[in-house]
């Protein structure tokens, strides 16, 4: 048993260009707090996988208000260490996630709003009882400086906190076969007494009274070979009398997982999947209660009044996860219609509509042409929120009020010749093209999309078209 300790030294803008904007403002003062999540081994698990070694929340830091015009400084931090107690042996290798959270203290409806500001993660080797290890991690433009260590809780000592020490009974030396407890030379290593009858060949213990089995063995005293089938499996020691495998109980027999955890066999022994609020090898550790405020983003904590009962976070709209730590990207559902811009404000969704559209989801198409006339015979066209005039030949501009050279815009397609005329323009088409503006090839070459002037077209017979 022992405690992992984390000391945050600073959180602020990292070096280099692109300094982040201050997370707080005069209108929205805020304060920071931190969450640490520990997992055994060098796993690269997802952020939301269980913190099997434990988790901790810091206190809230001092309230900070940005000074207008000043660069974002290192932000004021909460006092004290983050401590994560561990009940079993310290694994030596571990993964960590450290999250920096911002609590906004403005005029929020329904209390303060929390948002994740930065998340750093890493995998480290660390012996218990060693000195503080210093670390610097960057998340985007932010930089987090911190130190950490693992220390054993008496009477445990050693790099894994599995050796036990007791004060010396005699001042001069330790008892027979027992060594002094480095670095506590005035204490002696205590003999580790396993459960009575624990197999010396197939069992071992890390704490007194325990009997843990080596791979391939099971039972309370590790005397029963593991097997999955009585006669069909070719593995395992066979019984001299039957030639069959001895049907030993599996590692999940009797369900070693506490607090409603579910057991699954692994190649080495077993694994417990723990319910929320519990962790540890057998789900026996419950380090988080509702009093610790485990529910982020305004989540409501239910149950978990004492360390032996699980808590459940009821998340507000827009958040999910066992601790309401994950923001639901509600804009990914594209709720805003007609090209509206989606804004997820946390407590609500807003759609910023394009011109010509209105309504909570931009579902109402306003009549862009209402009350807007196009001059000189032009026709008004609704064009995605901005009215547009399709002008009669010889006129141009937004409202067709400008007299234009009808041929200036090259209105004849496919190489047709344009002639200005009192009634507008006339296109003299190249051979093989038809239409008022030569836009129709008589015999296209069958391509799926032709350029403006497809090459190689033979002249058609204009007499065949009216």
């Amino acid at each position: 048993a022992g405690v992992f300790e984390l000391q945050i030294h600073s959180f602020g803008p990292g070096p280099g260009p692109g300094a982040p904007r201050s997370p707080c403002s005069a209108r929205l003062p805020c304060r920071l707090f931190f969450r640490v999540c520990l997992k055994p081994g060098l796993s690269e698990e997802a952020a939301e996988s269980p913190c099997a070694l434990g988790a901790a929340l810091s206190a809230r830091g001092p309230v900070y208000t940005e000074q207008p015009g000043a660069p974002a400084p290192d932000l004021p931090l909460p006092d004290g260490l983050l401590q994560v107690p561990f009940r079993d042996a310290w694994p030596g290798t571990f993964s960590f996630i450290i999250e920096t959270w911002r609590e906004e203290l403005g005029d929020q409806i329904g209390g303060p709003a929390w948002s994740l500001l930065a998340r750093v993660a890493g995998r480290r080797r660390l012996a218990a009882g060693g000195p503080w290890a210093r670390d610097i991690q960057r998340a985007g433009a932010w930089e987090l400086r911190f130190s950490y260590r693992a220390r054993c809780e008496p009477p445990a000592v050693g790099t894994a906190c599995t050796r036990l020490c007791r004060p010396r009974s005699a001042p001069s030396r330790c008892g027979p076969g027992l060594r002094p407890c480095a670095p506590l030379e005035d204490e002696c290593e205590a003999p580790l007494v396993c459960r009575a009858g624990c197999s010396p060949e197939h069992g071992f213990c890390e704490q007194p009274g325990e009997c843990r089995c080596l791979e391939g063995w099971t039972g309370p005293l590790c005397t029963v070979p593991v097997s999955t089938s009585s006669c069909l499996s070719p593995r395992g020691p066979s019984s001299a009398t039957t030639g069959c495998l001895v049907p030993g109980p599996g590692p999940c027999d009797g369900n070693p997982c506490a607090n409603g955890g579910s057991c699954s066999e692994t190649p080495r022994s077993f694994e417990c999947t723990c319910p929320r609020g519990f962790y540890g090898l057998r789900c026996e550790v419950s380090g988080v209660t509702c009093a610790d405020g485990p529910c982020f983003n305004g989540g409501l904590c239910v149950g978990g009044a004492d360390p032996d009962s699980a808590y459940i976070c009821h998340c507000p709209p827009g958040f999910q996860g066992s601790n309401c730590e994950k923001r639901v990207d509600r804009c990914s559902l594209q709720p805003c219609r007609n090209g509206g811009l989606c804004l997820d404000l946390g407590h609500a969704l807003r759609c910023r509509c394009r011109a010509g559209f209105a309504g909570p989801r931009c579902e109402h198409d306003l009549d862009d042409c209402a009350g807007r006339a196009c001059a000189n015979g032009g026709t008004c066209v609704e064009g995605g929120g901005a009215h547009r005039c399709s002008c009669a030949l010889g006129f141009g501009g937004r409202d067709c009020r400008e007299r234009a050279d009808p041929c200036a815009a090259r209105p004849c397609a496919h190489g047709g010749r344009c002639y200005a005329h009192f009634s507008g323009l006339v296109c003299a088409c190249a051979p093989g093209y038809m239409g008022a503006r030569c836009e129709f090839p008589v015999h296209p070459d069958g391509a799926s999309a032709l350029p403006a002037a497809p090459p190689g077209l033979r002249p058609g017979d204009p007499q065949r078209y009216l």
Epitope: G435, R437, F440, L450, A452
Partner: nanobody, 117 residues
Framework: EVQLVESGGGLVQPGGSLTLSCAAS????????LAWYRQAPGKKRELVAG???????VYFVSVKGRFTISRDNAKNSVYLQMNSLRAEDTAVYYC???????????WGQGTLVTVSS
């Protein structure tokens, strides 16, 4: 990019009628010149009827009076109403759009019209 999707093709008896529809997306049809082409087996694709942005039309001489091209800018669609159909009208009919903003031509995938008794 303009996308064109034709519909309305099928089997019809000589003398019968059929209306082809073409829905355009990607650009407002007010700024497109639209047309119907057809391609009979073993023959070149040929213009059947076209309608310019100003509403002026052009028709293949053998369909004039039988076929009518029209456009509905509000529905972003162009139609070909075909009456008094003949066996020689059997072909794959293609929707065509000429974009004046690109400028470039676009084609639909085609719809089969079979006139047979």
């Amino acid at each position: 990019e303009v996308q064109l999707v034709e519909s309305g093709g099928g089997l019809v008896q000589p003398g019968g009628s059929l209306t082809l529809s073409c829905a355009a997306s990607g650009e407002t049809v007010s700024f497109l010149s639209l047309a119907w082409y057809r391609q009979a087996p073993g023959k070149k694709r040929e213009l059947v009827a076209g309608i310019s942005t100003d509403g002026s039309t052009v028709y293949f001489v053998s369909v004039k009076g039988r076929f009518t091209i029209s456009r509905d800018n509000a529905k972003n669609s162009v139609y070909l109403q075909m009456n008094s159909l003949r066996a020689e009208d059997t072909a794959v009919y293609y929707c065509y759009a000429y974009s004046w903003t690109t400028p470039r031509a676009y084609w639909g995938q085609g719809t089969l019209v079979t006139v047979s008794s």
